[in-house]
């Protein structure tokens, strides 16, 4: 009887189970009743990073100078290049597809520390009371308006990316 | 496409002033908060001065405060940068540079040398 699954490193086809291929190398042809899977090995540039039936192998990932990368670590045929930023830059991702001289902090986040050569900013989410509406990369939380102050009350409640709005007392005639 | 054109550059004594501005386009000027940056001969890049879009809220490194001052004329898409009691440290070539400040946003610089 035709097996229903097959052991790891292993899949089905044609009703029978044949080896995938090891990684840094594709699949050329699926095993027969009278032969093995054949496999051949990735290209330069090229690679593949798990046990697999790809018949394509993967390029390496290119790191673009002219956005700022560099090759941290060389690509082989099982793995892929790492990318990182020229000195004094910072990866936009964990992926390090594009470099920043230093990252900004979102709406709701205030900056903690502005950037220096060796430190990228550090944000941090704005508490209650305080706010922030930019995208910034100097800009810390700001206050919430008191509406007190000004002999207003307080019309909307303000949020960590909006201020409060003040408006007129209601007074009683 | 980002452009940022940065000029005003030249030979000054220390003590004298200088007046670099950095002509934008490619972008709508006046959204962006806006930076200037130096790298100083054989040194890392050093963040200046930076304003926010609407030219009401600035930052000042340690070593510029009180001498340099920053800022903008969002209806001409322009930013400047005032430099009063120049020194030999601030020596350097000065790029203007916008959020989010990736590498390919960058002028060509314009070099500034204070030396008697």
């Known amino acids: 009887e035709p097996p229903t699954a097959c052991r790891e490193k292993q899949y089905l086809i044609n009703s029978q189970c044949c080896s995938l291929c090891q990684p840094g190398q594709k699949l050329v042809s699926d095993c027969t009743e009278f032969t093995e899977t054949e496999c051949l090995p990735c290209g330069e540039s090229e690679f593949l990073d798990t046990w697999n039936r790809e018949t394509h192998c993967h390029q390496h990932k290119y790191c673009d100078p002219n956005l700022g990368l560099r090759v941290q670590q060389k690509g082989t045929s099982e793995t892929d290049t790492i990318c990182t930023c020229e000195e004094g830059w910072h990866c936009t991702s964990e992926a390090c597809e594009s470099c920043v001289l230093h990252r900004s902090c979102s709406p709701g986040f205030g900056v903690k520390q502005i950037a220096t050569g060796v430190s990228d900013t550090i944000c941090e989410p704005c508490p209650v009371g305080f706010f922030s509406n930019v995208s910034s990369a100097f800009e810390k939380c700001h206050p919430w308006t008191s509406c007190e102050t000004k002999d207003l009350v307080v019309q909307q409640a303000g949020t960590n990316k909006t201020d409060v709005v003040c408006g007129p007392q209601d007074r009683l005639r | 496409e980002v452009q940022l054109l940065e000029s005003g550059g030249g030979l000054v004594q220390p003590g004298g002033s200088l007046r670099l501005s950095c002509a934008a386009s490619g972008f709508t000027f006046r959204d962006y908060e806006m930076w200037w940056v130096r790298q100083a001969p054989g040194k890392g890049l050093e963040r200046v001065s930076a304003i926010n879009p609407q030219g009401t809220r600035t930052y000042y490194a340690d070593s510029v405060k009180g001498r340099f001052t920053i800022s903008r004329d969002n209806s001409k898409n322009t930013l400047y940068l005032q430099m009063n009691s120049l020194r030999a440290e601030d020596t350097a070539v000065y790029y203007c540079?916008?959020?989010?400040?990736?590498?390919?946003?960058w002028g060509q610089g314009t070099l500034v040398t204070v030396s008697s």
């Open positions: 540079a916008k959020l989010p400040f990736t590498f390919e946003d």
